[in-house]
Interface confidence: low
Amino acid sequence: GELETSDVVTVVLGQDAKLPCFYRGDSGEQVGQVAWARVDAGEGAQELALLHSKYGLHVSPAYEGRVEQPPPPRNPLDGSVLLRNAVQADEGEYECRVSTFPAGSFQARLRLRVLVPPLPSLNPGPALEEGQGLTLAASCTAEGSPAPSVTWDTEVKGTTSSRSFKHSRSAAVTSEFHLVPSRSMNGQPLTCVVSHPGLLQDQRITHILHVSFLAEASVRGLEDQNLWHIGREGAMLKCLSEGQPPPSYNWTRLDGPLPSGVRVDGDTLGFPPLTTEHSGIYVCHVSNEFSSRDSQVTVDVLDPQEDSGKQVDLVSAS
């Protein structure tokens, strides 16, 4: 006869490990007892359990409550045992010794491998601002046994670098994603993907990128200069910009206070029926936590009685 077992039994942390040991004998042969021991190199054998055909299962004190026989029905030639709730410390070499009648004793070894699935964490880098050089966007760390694989899934262009720290029974892998921040990256997902043989599927953690920026400011409303004449109603100037965080707007007049009746409504400056008093230089000031921009325009209200052309200047400054 001969023993059937596995070279390696792989189990995920916390699961039950079946340690197989089956005697395939000739007709009429019987198994008297099966002794299980842990036999790691450099250490003496440590008994796990003794499985006796007549007296049943006896578990050594060190493994009390953790070693059981597989559920019925049981084959009398099957000396397999279950090791409950596998922990990392269980990883190692195990031996089953089978005493048979009349063929004698047989022994076989297997290696128990305990997979420790990682619990990944993602840490965003410093605040991203347009104009920075290559900057850390996020780092992702996962520790497990064996070492997990950490990669990135994103449409954003960047560079990655990884490092690994080995511990006695596991390894921690950290991957960093560096990029050159630009406004087009705003709202883009950056996903850390962790693969490991102890995971049924890859673990994914997504970080949404936020890049601070402020676009140049410009003023709309003066495109048709002939509309800016005395008596016109509904005249308005609109300040155009965009930014992250969203900017706030402030209107001032460079050559004095805003005329009475002029309404400020966020990015829009609304005028009452135009008079020559509304002529002047108006400044839109756009700001967010990242930066500020100014754009100024010169309004020259035409008097239809006069046949003089109107000048309109647009100046943008940051």
Epitope: G125, P126, G133, L134, L136, S161, S162, R163, T174, E176
Partner: antibody
Framework: EVQLVESGGGLVQPGGSLRLSCAAS???????MSWVRQAPGKGLEWVSR???????DYADSVKGRFTISRDNSKNTLYLQMNSLRAEDTAVYYC???????????????WGQGTLVTVSS | DIQMTQSPSSLSASVGDRVTITCRAS??????LAWYQQKPGKAPKLLIY???SLQSGVPSRFSGSGSGTDFTLTISSLQPEDFATYYC?????????FGQGTKVEIK
């Protein structure tokens, strides 16, 4: 063990050019490489870095005047310095980013440095 | 750019003394900090990476600690060969920046 040897330093007039070389024994081209300089009696200042794909970063003080490059076949790193100024006077070191852990950009191997003097 | 400020700028100590050098970043840099030693006429030498990890071949009397903005390099028992200038460097974001240096002299 990696060894880095810089050359190409010397005396140059303001506005002039120099090309520094950094020859490596041992393979450096699966790593990032940097130039760091040190003005006489002063501290260390990072100048430029080149990545494995050939892309690069520069300090604001040298942007537009200096160009970093690498020749993988010769295992050599270069720094082309144009429009040199008196304040560029320094010992220039080439240095390798730590290879085995890729932890950010600390520098584990440095050359002995080459002196660049910009003076009329 | 992130500013790195070392203190003190110089110190005098005797062989066997415990020496502490601090480095402060103008913004949080996690553990992205390295310490270097430089002797006159020589290139800098990496002592500590990742704020607290000892570079291979560096004596265990050197240690680093800290995270965020405040970091410390400690020499537990100063030896004759430790008299040099020490620099911290952040590599959290580009450009990497160095502290101004701390010169350790013989008392």
């Amino acid at each position: 063990e990696v060894q880095l040897v810089e050359s190409g330093g010397g005396l140059v007039q303001p506005g002039g050019s120099l090309r520094l070389s950094c020859a490596a024994s041992g393979d450096i081209f699966d790593t990032y490489m940097s130039w760091v300089r040190q003005a006489p009696g002063k501290g260390l200042e990072w100048v430029s870095r080149i990545y494995t794909d050939g892309s690069s970063d520069y300090a604001d003080s040298v942007k537009g005047r200096f160009t970093i490059s690498r020749d993988n076949s010769k295992n050599t790193l270069y720094l082309q310095m144009n429009s040199l100024r008196a304040e560029d006077t320094a010992v220039y070191y080439c240095a390798r980013q730590t290879e085995d852990r890729s932890y950010g950009y600390d520098l584990d191997y440095w050359g002995q440095g080459t002196l660049v003097t910009v003076s009329s | 750019d992130i500013q790195m400020t070392q203190s003190p700028s110089s110190l005098s100590a005797s062989v066997g003394d415990r020496v502490t050098i601090t480095c402060r970043a103008s913004q949080g840099i996690s553990s992205y900090l390295a310490w270097y030693q430089q002797k006159p006429g020589k290139a800098p030498k990496l002592l500590i990476y990742a704020a607290s990890s000892l570079q291979s071949g560096v004596p265990s009397r050197f240690s680093g600690s800290g995270s965020g903005t405040d970091f410390t390099l400690t020499i537990s028992s100063l030896q004759p060969e430790d008299f040099a200038t020490y620099y911290c460097q952040q590599h959290y974001t580009t450009p990497p920046t160095f502290g101004q240096g701390t010169k350790v002299e013989i008392k």
